[in-house]
């Protein structure tokens, strides 16, 4: 369960890939599209509001006999729109929604090497936001094997 309904902190940051491509958001035909692209030098990076929530993870689920806490985030590039996992389509989409947000809008935050982070679907453990064919997609990762895979690594910069 997510502790309380308000985030423990929020920050505005631009999101880029391990390879320094920018995640950008464009309004097209009354819906938002998400792109992964090289930005021209003078172009301003899109900012995302990251809201951080503390989630209690009961020992019955944790598998190691102790309660734990996770840090979860929601990502909102513009008012009332949030990134959401579409597990059926293995896609990442922007949806307009009201609070309380659906579970599909929450991602477990992982610290990674090179001061990168990864975003794991709350609704589908082992599935992460990643980059595929210049778009964001949901990527299944074998935790024991390949957590260093660059396509699920992101940089946050204020």
């Amino acid at each position: 369960s997510i502790t309380g309904i308000s985030p423990i902190t929020e920050s505005l940051a631009s999101l880029s890939t391990y390879n320094d491509q920018s995640i950008t958001f464009a309004l097209e035909d009354e819906s938002y599209e998400i792109y992964v692209e090289d930005l021209k030098k003078d172009k301003k990076k899109d900012k995302v509001l990251l809201s951080y929530y503390e989630s209690q993870h009961p020992s019955s689920e944790s598998g190691d006999g102790v309660d734990g806490k996770m840090l979860m985030v929601t990502l909102s590039p513009t008012k009332d729109f949030w990134l959401q996992a579409n597990n059926k389509e293995h896609s990442v989409e922007l949806h307009k929604c009201e609070k309380p947000l659906p579970d599909q809008a929450f991602f477990v935050l992982h610290n990674r090497s090179f001061n990168c982070v990864s975003f794991e679907c709350k609704t589908d453990p082992g599935v992460f936001i990643g980059v595929k064919d210049n778009h964001l997609a949901l990527i299944k990762v074998d935790y024991s094997e390949n957590l260093g895979s660059e396509n699920i690594l992101f940089k946050l910069s204020e």
Epitope: I8, S11, L71
Partner: antibody
Framework: QVQLQESGPGLVKPSETLSLTCTVS????????VHWIRQPPGKGLEWIGV???????GYNSALMSRVTISKDTSKSQVSLKLSSVTAADTAVYYC???????????????WGQGTLVTVSS | DIQMTQSPSSVSASVGDRVTITCLAS??????LAWYQQKPGKSPKLLIY???RLADGVPSRFSGSGSGTDFTLTISSLQPEDFATYYC?????????FGQGTKVEIK
């Protein structure tokens, strides 16, 4: 309950390699990062490095060329190796566990009791 | 690397006093700051995380504030068991650097 216990030789000769082990219980190394921190006598805390839940490592820039952190998941152990030691490496060495699953943002909630390592011939 | 500067390096205070310790980061770290208490011969104890969150079991006389580069630890009414050394630590980016410490001594 959660426990971390440092172990290793209390005396190391200059130019040799300092080797310490942190044995953990009550949690899984695949879910939590484990950090090494040291404290020279009468001085402040210095972060040495981390072994993250996903297996990647991060190190103090000043020590990076001499330090290696690794784990043996089957034994629930995280090891620290610091090569080419000098008297300046004399310190109490601590291991500590992240507050959050998978993330270091929440600080270190559980600490070992620390072990004093003296570098002297 | 991010430098953390604590002030003062020591403070003399009496039981019941309000004590304030500040920590300045050399670049913005959002809310990713922790405060620890350490007593002689003991391991550090987490007091505050995410700049303002009280760790489990920590008395409510301890509080944290700030974000970005400027942070404060406040002890609202100093108790005998609070005489110790306090450290801040940034957790925004590796290496996770500590401040140099503030010793709270009996006046």
């Amino acid at each position: 309950q959660v426990q971390l216990q440092e172990s290793g030789p209390g005396l190391v000769k200059p130019s040799e390699t300092l080797s310490l082990t942190c044995t953990v219980s009550g949690f899984s190394l695949s879910k939590y990062g484990v950090h090494w921190i040291r404290q020279p006598p009468g001085k402040g805390l210095e972060w040495i490095g981390v072994l993250r839940a996903g297996g990647s490592t991060g190190y103090n820039s000043a020590l990076m060329s001499r330090v290696t952190i690794s784990k043996d998941t089957s034994k629930s152990q995280v090891s620290l190796k610091l090569s080419s030691v000098t008297a300046a490496d004399t310190a109490v060495y601590y291991c500590a566990r992240d507050h959050y699953y998978y993330s270091s943002y929440g600080g270190f909630v559980y600490w070992g009791q620390g072990t004093l390592v003296t570098v002297s011939s | 690397d991010i430098q953390m500067t604590q002030s003062p390096s020591s403070v003399s205070a009496s039981v019941g006093d309000r004590v304030t310790i500040t920590c300045l980061a050399s670049q913005t770290i959002g809310a990713w700051l922790a405060w620890y208490q350490q007593k002689p011969g003991k391991s550090p104890k987490l007091l505050i995380y995410a700049a303002t969150r009280l760790a489990d079991g920590v008395p409510s006389r301890f509080s944290g504030s700030g974000s970005g580069t400027d942070f404060t630890l406040t002890i609202s009414s100093l108790q005998p068991e609070d005489f110790a050394t306090y450290y801040c630590q940034q957790l925004d980016s590796s290496p996770y650097t500590f401040g140099q410490g503030t010793k709270v001594e009996i006046k």
